[in-house]
Interface confidence: medium
């Protein structure tokens, strides 16, 4: 579990604007506001680490801080799924793990966290400024996604601690279950705001550590907020993208699964071609121009079925049936 504070750190107001009493009444509303907004909501954290031994090797760790059961985890790079991101691995608690190059090893660390080791060379290797995103689908919370990248000044072998992601998206309504104490705090917050509404507001310095102020563009809106806010996702160095996507399939047009859910994704097929061209359900590439099919290469690596997905202090957990891990 994470030990960092859940509330963003606020810089003190500039000297002379308000006294100590004013500072207390200034910070308290923000703390209460943050608690009111985040109470009862799940959170996703992402940690990206470059291995000291191999500069082209990355380890991505993601975790879900929520009470629901995780039904699926999707790890992508180059932005969130549906916003230009490419899926690296899909982890299903029952069906196992499927991973795609340059992912080398994806695994469950606990029932609510995963890790993914990436390696590669040349065009398929990740770069230091590549953004990695993790999306957790859980019940009943819904889908939650967060993104992270390697801190710009980090040395190989080091990484920032797992940073709590801002709350990016909730697919289900009614998940903000505010407790009675927090409800009281919210009421008190409104009371304070009303008291201070005619008082000149002190200026705050932008926080250097708040998750809301992305460090090296570490966080990005989910596909839902991207669509709503039209926020350009400008972090990606295109030279770091997999060569197979950029060079091998130059005709990949609009996706038919337009924005990628946890378990769906891009289609190299424009809407105009739906009626005339059959769309491959798995493992094939469609050229929009000529409708011909070319095999997209080998299937993801197949690992044997004897994988224990969740470490259990009481010993290996029995799984019903083979996992069919790829």
């Amino acid at each position: 579990m994470r030990t960092e504070a859940q509330v963003p750190a606020l810089q003190p107001p500039e000297p002379g604007l308000e006294g100590a009493m004013g500072h207390r009444t200034l910070v308290l509303p923000w703390v209460l506001l943050t608690l009111c907004v985040t109470a009862g909501t799940p959170e996703v954290w992402v940690q990206v680490r470059m291995e000291a031994t191999e500069l082209s090797s990355f380890t991505i760790r993601c975790g879900f801080l929520g009470s629901g059961s995780i039904s699926l985890v999707t790890v992508s790079w180059g932005g969130p799924n549906g916003a230009g991101g490419t899926t690296l691995a899909v982890l299903h608690p029952e069906r196992g793990i499927r991973q795609w190059a340059p992912a080398r090893q994806a695994r469950w660390e606990t029932q609510s966290s995963i890790s993914l080791i990436l390696e590669g060379s040349g065009a398929s290797s990740p770069c230091a400024n590549t953004t990695f995103c993790c999306k957790f689908a859980s019940f009943p919370e819904g889908s939650w996604e967060a993104c992270g990248s390697l801190p710009p000044s980090s040395d190989p072998g080091l990484s920032a601690p797992p940073t709590p992601a801002p709350i990016l998206r909730a697919d289900l309504a009614g998940i903000l279950g505010v407790s009675g104490v927090l409800l009281f705090g919210c009421v008190y917050l409104l009371h304070l705001l009303r008291r201070h509404k005619h008082r000149p507001a002190p200026r705050l310095q932008p926080s250097r550590t708040s998750p809301q102020a992305p460090r090296a563009r570490a966080w990005a809106p989910s596909q839902a907020s991207q669509a709503a806010l039209h926020v350009p996702y400008a972090t990606i160095n295109t030279s770091c993208r997999p060569a197979t996507l950029d060079t091998a399939h130059p005709h990949g047009g609009p996706s038919w699964w337009a924005s990628l859910p946890t378990h769906a994704a891009h289609r190299p097929q424009g809407p105009a071609a739906w009626a005339s061209t059959p769309i491959p359900a798995r493992g094939s590439f469609v050229s929009v121009e000529n409708g011909l099919y070319a095999q997209a290469g080998e299937r993801p690596p197949h690992t044997g079925p004897g994988l224990t997905l969740f470490p259990d202090p009481r010993g290996p957990r029995a799984m019903e049936g083979p996992l069919g891990v790829r």
Epitope: F139, G142, D171, G252, W257, H263, P268, P280, A281, S284
Partner: antibody, heavy 127, light 107 residues
Amino acid sequence: EVQLVETGGGLIQPGRSLRLSCAASGFTFSSYAMHWVRQAPGKGLEWVAVISYDGSNKYYADSVKGRFTISRDNSKNTLYLQMNSLRAEDTAVYYCARDVMVYCSSTSCYFYGMDVWGQGTTVTVSS
Amino acid sequence: DIQMTQSPSSLSASVGDRVTVTCQASQDIRDYLNWYQKKPGKAPKLLIYDASNLEAGVPSRFSGSGSGTDFTFTISGLQPEDVATYYCQQFENLPITFGQGTRLEIK
């Protein structure tokens, strides 16, 4: 408990319209692609349509293309099938089904199979 | 469209028997094939996914094998509750297509 419940079936005249609903519960509906599959009397299963998790993209069997429309309302956890210009050959039990997991890269799409099905609703098209 | 041909269309066997159903695809579908069980008045049930993987909660007497165009579904020890129609389904290409079904009865 994960559950899908179809409603809206009935006896309808050829050329008329009907809308089927599928209410989902017990899982994060908005994270799953959903299918409609039908079974005509004495016949086998026939896939009808699929819709992406957010409703933005759909694909249909040739036999229903242009007449049927699949849609969803994630806020209501409900899948729909709007059936227009109904024909006698559309008579069937209609099932909604959840795709256990769909992953698509820009070159491939991975359907994992329909792991949760509703009990079905019967549509009879007859004059 | 990819055609799926199942055989036999129906079969009768005794409790405890080993029952085998085959499914042939009109083109290579690698192992992108599922097997479903359908009982009258009930919803279909996923038994085998990716040609050979047993769905969680499904008895181990059910198994599947094959790759490419030829697939086999086996019930190693037939039970009375296995009376149903069994369908193969390919998901290599859209549209997703099913075999015509194999109706299984108890002698």
